[in-house]
Interface confidence: low
C-alpha cells in the first residue's frame, strides 16, 4: 500500500493530535459530523474542494508536539513525510505562549490550471492577522516518481523538490508546481511546510493525479440571442486546451417588471435555451465548467453578461427567403409595462398596408404569428432592400420592426463543352436577382457517375466551384477534366448572415452541351461544265456523334447577303448548289451540330472563296457590225468588223481570244485568230463571203455564233 494520502476533489480532514489521544478527540472540519462521509468515505462539498487543517485548543500546554494526519473513516493510517531533517517523522512544535487558545487551521485547495501546465495549491491561514508580526513562510515539497508502483514506500530524503510559495497577502499563499504534459496522469507526491516564528507546521504526505484535479479556465464567448422560435439561447465556447469534455453550470436571472426568476442548470452542451422570454426584461448570465466524465474542479465563473430584450420582440427578427415561399414572424409586444394580449395584435407591412387578419395566428396568450404565402420579390424602396413588418396593437405600432428579404433566386446556368471534349465552361449572371448587401454567391455542384436524374435536386454532398466575373457581367466557371457521361447538378448558393438560399438546381451532361469544332478543309468552287457551286468540308474529329451541317454562302463583298442551306445527312462531305452568277466570287462558311439536336452549333468555319475561272465554253460569239470601204465599182473592198467584248455571263467566264471564220465558194473555209482585239479588217474579193466571229476561252469556242454574208452588189453600211 502507499503511505501517502490521496487528494481528490472532495474534502478530507487534517487532524493534529497530541500524543496518546484517541480518534474521538479529533476535531472534524467545520460543519461536518463523523458520519457524514459519502459512499467512498470522502467528505464532499458541492461547490469546491477545500482541505481543512484544524487543530485542538492549545490551553494549558507549555510545549506540545503535534502529529498532523489526513484521515478518512476507512483509513486509520497516518502518512508521514520524509524531508531533509535526517528522514525523521515531521512534528509540529507549537509555542504555547504564542498559540494558546487558538485553533491551528489551514484551508488547502489545489488544482491543475486550465492550461494543463501548472499545479497550484492555495494555502489559506485561518489564523487571520496572527502571523503579520512573524517571519511567515510556506514551502511545498513535491516529487513526481518515475514509476510509483515500483516504489510503494514514501520517497526518501533528498528526492523532494521544494518550491517557495508566494504569500503576497499573508493570509493566502500560492504554490506553483510545474507539471510536464507527459506526467499529467502520473501521481504527484507533496507535503506542505509552514514556518512562522520559529515554529514549523508540516502536513503529512499527499498524493494526487493532476489530470483528476483540472480546474478549467472559465468558458469563453458567452453571448445571448433570441432564437427563431422565441427562446433565449445562451451560448458559450469551451476553454481551449481542455483534454476532455466538460459539463457546465449556468446561472441566470431574469428581471422584468412582472417577474424575477433565477435558475441554475447543469448542461453538457455549450448552449442552453431559456423559454418564455419576456419583452422589456434583462437577463444576467454566468457560466462555469468542470470535467464531465471524471473528477475535477469547477472553473471560476465567467464574467457576467447582461442581455436586455426590447419592448417588442420579433422572432425571427429578420428573414431571408426566396420567391414563392411561405414564411412566418412571431411577436410579443409589451406596452406600458403590460404585455399586449396576442388577440389584440395587428400586423402591418411597411406601415402602409395592413396585413389581413386571415394571415394571423394566436400561438399563446402573448405570442402572435403572421404568415406570408407565395411571396413576391422585395422591391427596393430607396436604400431599403427589405419589407418592414410591424407588430402593432389596435391603436399604435412600435417603432421597431422585423425585416423580410425576398429574393428571386432563379439564376440560369448555361454550360458548354469545348470541341476537344476536355472542359466544360458554365456561365451565369446575377443581373436577374436583386443584390443583397454583404452576400456572396457561389456555384455548387454534385457529379453523379452517369446522367442526370429526371428531376434535379440539391444533393446533400456538394462541392463549390470557383467562378470569375467576366467583362460582360457573367460569371464563368470551368470544369476540367470532365466526365462526358456524368450528370453535373449545379446551383447557385447565396450566402448571407441571415442564412443561405439556393437557386433551383439544373443538371448538365457535358456530352449533351458540346459545341463542336467547326468543320475543317472547307472548299468552294464552281464546277466546270456543270456550273454548280460545290462546297466540301471535313467533319471535326470530336464529337463522335452524327452531325448536321449548315452552309451559308453569298456573293463576296463588304456586306454578304447570306443564303442558308442545311445538310442532315451525317455522312455528307460536300454539296452542290445552283447559283445565279457562275462568274462571281462566292464566300462560303460551314458549321455543325449534333444531329440529334443536343448541344450547340459550332462557330462558322473560316470562309472559303470561289475563284472565277472558265466554267463552260462561251455561250455565244459576239454580235458584230461591219464597215465596208472602197470603190463601189471595184470588186475589192475593205470590210471592217467591229464587236463589243463578250460579257462574263456570256463568256463563262472569260475570253482569251476571238477567231474569225471565213467561208467563200472559191477559197473554201479558213480561220484567222485576232487575239483579244475587237476590230478586224479583211479584203472582200469574192461574190459571196461569209464571216463568223467566235469567242474562245480555256474550255473551247463558242457554239452559238453570229454570221454575216457579203454578196454583190452591196453598198456601204453604217
Amino acid at each position: 500500500f502507499n503511505l501517502s494520502y490521496p487528494i481528490t476533489p472532495w474534502r478530507f480532514k487534517l487532524s493534529c493530535m497530541p500524543p496518546n489521544s484517541t480518534y474521538d478527540y479529533f476535531l472534524l472540519p467545520a460543519g461536518l459530523s463523523k458520519n457524514t462521509s459519502n459512499s467512498n468515505g470522502h467528505y464532499e462539498t458541492a461547490v469546491e474542494p477545500k482541505f481543512n487543517s484544524s487543530g485542538t485548543h492549545f490551553s494549558n500546554l507549555s510545549k506540545t508536539t503535534f502529529h498532523c494526519c489526513f484521515r478518512s473513516e476507512q483509513d486509520r493510517n497516518c502518512s508521514l513525510c520524509a524531508d531533509n531533517i535526517e528522514g525523521k517523522t515531521f512534528v509540529s512544535t507549537v509555542n504555547s505562549l504564542v498559540f494558546q487558545q487558538i485553533d491551528a487551521n489551514w484551508n488547502i485547495q489545489c488544482w491543475l490550471k486550465g492550461d494543463l501546465k501548472l499545479f497550484i495549491c492555495y494555502v489559506e491561514s485561518l489564523f487571520k492577522n496572527l502571523f503579520r508580526n512573524y517571519n511567515y513562510k510556506v514551502h511545498l515539497l513535491y516529487v513526481l516518481p518515475e514509476v510509483l508502483e515500483d516504489s510503494p514506500l514514501v520517497p526518501q530524503k533528498g528526492s523532494f523538490q521544494m518550491v517557495h510559495c508566494n504569500c503576497s497577502v499573508h493570509e493566502c499563499c500560492e504554490c506553483l508546481v510545474p507539471v510536464p504534459t507527459a506526467k499529467l496522469n502520473d501521481t504527484l507526491l507533496m507535503c506542505l511546510k509552514i514556518t512562522s516564528g520559529g515554529v514549523i507546521f508540516q502536513s503529512p504526505l499527499m498524493s494526487v493525479q493532476p489530470i483528476n484535479m483540472v480546474k478549467p479556465d472559465p468558458p469563453l464567448g458567452l453571448h445571448m440571442e433570441i432564437t427563431d422560435d422565441g427562446n433565449l439561447k445562451i451560448s458559450w465556447s469551451s476553454p481551449p486546451l481542455v483534454p476532455f469534455p466538460l459539463q457546465y453550470q449556468v446561472k441566470y436571472s431574469e428581471n422584468s417588471t412582472t417577474v424575477i426568476r433565477e435558475a441554475d442548470k447543469i448542461v453538457s452542451a455549450t448552449s442552453l435555451l431559456v423559454d418564455s422570454i419576456l419583452p422589456g426584461s434583462s437577463y444576467e448570465v454566468q457560466v462555469r465548467g468542470k470535467r464531465l466524465d471524471g473528477p475535477g474542479i469547477w472553473s471560476d465563473w465567467s464574467t457576467p453578461r447582461v442581455f436586455t430584450t426590447q419592448d417588442v420582440i420579433y422572432f425571427p427578427p429578420k428573414i431571408l427567403t426566396s420567391v414563392g415561399s411561405n414564411v412566418s414572424f412571431h411577436c410579443i409586444y409589451k406596452k406600458e409595462n403590460k404585455i399586449v394580449p396576442s388577440k389584440e395584435i395587428v400586423w402591418w407591412m411597411n406601415l402602409a398596408e395592413k396585413i389581413p387578419q386571415s394571415q394571423y395566428d394566436v400561438v399563446s396568450d402573448h405570442v402572435s404569428k403572421v404568415t406570408f404565402f407565395n411571396l413576391n420579390e422585395t422591391k427596393p424602396r430607396g436604400k431599403f432592400t427589405y419589407d418592414a413588418v410591424y407588430c402593432c396593437n389596435e391603436h399604435e405600432c412600435h417603432h421597431r420592426y422585423a425585416e423580410l428579404y425576398v429574393i428571386d433566386v432563379n439564376i440560369n446556368i448555361s454550360c458548354e463543352t469545348d470541341g476537344y471534349l476536355t472542359k466544360m465552361t458554365c456561365r451565369w449572371s446575377t443581373s436577374t436577382i436583386q443584390s443583397l448587401a454583404e452576400s456572396t454567391l457561389q456555384l455548387r455542384y454534385h457529379r453523379s457517375s452517369l446522367y442526370c436524374s429526371d428531376i434535379p435536386s440539391i444533393h446533400p454532398i456538394s462541392e463549390p466551384k470557383d467562378c470569375y466575373l467576366q467583362s460582360d457581367g457573367f460569371y464563368e466557371c470551368i470544369f476540367q477534366p470532365i466526365f462526358l457521361l456524368s450528370g453535373y447538378t449545379m446551383w447557385i448558393r447565396i450566402n448571407h448572415s441571415l442564412g443561405s438560399l439556393d437557386s433551383p438546381p439544373t443538371c448538365v451532361l457535358p456530352d449533351s452541351v458540346v459545341k463542336p469544332l467547326p468543320p475543317s478543309s472547307v472548299k468552294a468552287e464552281i464546277t466546270i461544265n456543270i456550273g454548280l457551286l460545290k462546297i466540301s468540308w471535313e467533319k471535326p474529329v470530336f464529337p463522335e456523334n452524327n452531325l448536321q451541317f449548315q452552309i451559308r454562302y453569298g456573293l463576296s463583298g463588304k456586306e454578304v447577303q447570306w443564303k442558308m442551306y442545311e445538310v442532315y445527312d451525317a455522312k455528307s462531305k460536300s454539296v452542290s448548289l445552283p447559283v445565279p452568277d457562275l462568274c462571281a466570287v462566292y464566300a462560303v462558311q460551314v458549321r455543325c451540330k449534333r444531329l440529334d439536336g443536343l448541344g450547340y452549333w459550332s462557330n462558322w468555319s473560316n470562309p472559303a472563296y470561289t475563284v472565277v475561272m472558265d466554267i463552260k465554253v462561251p455561250m455565244r460569239g459576239p454580235e458584230f457590225w461591219r464597215i465596208i470601204n472602197g470603190d463601189t465599182m471595184k470588186k475589192e473592198k475593205n470590210v471592217t468588223l467591229l464587236w463589243k467584248p463578250l460579257m462574263k455571263n456570256d463568256s463563262l467566264c472569260s475570253v482569251q481570244r476571238y477567231v474569225i471564220n471565213h467561208h467563200t465558194s472559191c477559197n473554201g473555209t479558213w480561220s484567222e485568230d485576232v487575239g483579244n482585239h475587237t476590230k478586224f479588217t479583211f479584203l472582200w474579193t469574192e461574190q459571196a463571203h461569209t464571216v463568223t466571229v467566235l469567242a474562245i476561252n480555256s474550255i473551247g469556242a463558242s457554239v452559238a455564233n453570229f454570221n454575216l454574208t457579203f454578196s454583190w452588189p452591196m453598198s456601204k453600211v453604217n
Epitope: 457517375s449 452517369l450 446522367y451 436524374s453 429526371d454 466526365f483 457521361l485 451532361l509 449533351s512
Partner: antibody, heavy 117, light 108 residues
Framework: QVQLLQSGGGVVQPGRSLRLSCAAS????????MHWVRQAPGKGLEWVAV????????YYADSVKGRFTISRDNSKNTLYLQMNSLRAEDTAVYYC??????????WGQGTLVTVSS | EIVLTQSPGTLSLSPGERATLSCRAS???????LAWYQQKPGQAPRLLIY???SRPTGIPDRFSGSGSGTDFTLTISRLEPEDFAVYYC?????????FGGGTKLEIK
C-alpha cells in the same frame, strides 16, 4: 421484387442479325439507366452499351459501335439490343442490367448468343 | 479508357480465413466510383460493394471495400462456404465502363 426477364438469344450465322429483349418489373423502369453487359464463354465481363432513363443518350463499346443499337420502350418497361452484322467474337452470354448510378444493381438472368456458321 | 487489373488471378483459402482481393486502376478513379461483384457459375453477377466502400442492403457485413484513387481492396473477413466464386471490380467514373479481369476464390 425486381425482375429483369431476358429473351431473344440463340444461334445465328455471321453477318446476320438478332434482337434481344429485357422485360423489367418491380421497380420504376423509366427512372433507371439500362445497360447490356456480355460475357464470352470462360471469360470476364465486358460492357456493351447503355441508354439513359429517357432514351435521349446512348453509348456503345468500340467493339460494337455501328453494329449494335440499344433502345427502350418505357411504356412497355422493355429494353432492347438490336445486333446487326454479327461476328464470331460476339458469341457470349448477354446480360441486361439496371442502374441508378453506373454500378449494376439489378441483373437479368442472361441469354446466350452463339454466332457460328 | 481506365484499365482495371485484379490480383491475384486465383486465391486458394479455407473457410473461416480472411480474403483480400486487389483491384488496381490505370488512372485515378474519380469520386471512388468503383464497384465489386460476385459471380457464381451459371449465374448473373451480384453487386457487393459500390462507391468503393458502401454495401447494398442484404449484403453480409463480412464483405467490406476500401481504397481510393488507383488502389482498391475487397475484404471478406471470415470466409463462408458460399463465398467461393469469381469476383470482379468495375469502375463507373469514366466512359467506357470497364471491368477487371476477375479473381477466382477457390477452396484450399
Amino acid at each position: 421484387q425486381v425482375q429483369l426477364l431476358q429473351s431473344g438469344g440463340g444461334v445465328v450465322q455471321p453477318g446476320r442479325s438478332l434482337r434481344l429483349s429485357c422485360a423489367a418489373s418491380g421497380f420504376t423502369f423509366s427512372s433507371y439507366g439500362m445497360h447490356w453487359v456480355r460475357q464470352a464463354p470462360g471469360k470476364g465481363l465486358e460492357w456493351v452499351a447503355v441508354i439513359s432513363y429517357d432514351g435521349s443518350n446512348k453509348y456503345y463499346a468500340d467493339s460494337v459501335k455501328g453494329r449494335f443499337t440499344i433502345s427502350r420502350d418505357n411504356s412497355k418497361n422493355t429494353l432492347y439490343l438490336q445486333m446487326n452484322s454479327l461476328r464470331a467474337e460476339d458469341t457470349a452470354v448477354y446480360y441486361c442490367a439496371g442502374v441508378r448510378e453506373n454500378y449494376f444493381s439489378y441483373w437479368g438472368q442472361g441469354t446466350l448468343v452463339t454466332v457460328s456458321s | 479508357e481506365i484499365v482495371l487489373t485484379q490480383s491475384p488471378g486465383t486465391l486458394s483459402l479455407s473457410p473461416g480465413e480472411r480474403a483480400t482481393l486487389s483491384c488496381r486502376a490505370s488512372q485515378s478513379v474519380s469520386s471512388n466510383y468503383l464497384a465489386w461483384y460476385q459471380q457464381k457459375p451459371g449465374q448473373a453477377p451480384r453487386l457487393l460493394i459500390y462507391g468503393a466502400s458502401s454495401r447494398p442492403t442484404g449484403i453480409p457485413d463480412r464483405f467490406s471495400g476500401s481504397g481510393s484513387g488507383t488502389d482498391f481492396t475487397l475484404t471478406i473477413s471470415r470466409l463462408e462456404p458460399e463465398d467461393f466464386a469469381v469476383y470482379y471490380c468495375q469502375q463507373y467514373a469514366a466512359s467506357p465502363l470497364t471491368f477487371g479481369g476477375g479473381t477466382k476464390l477457390e477452396i484450399k
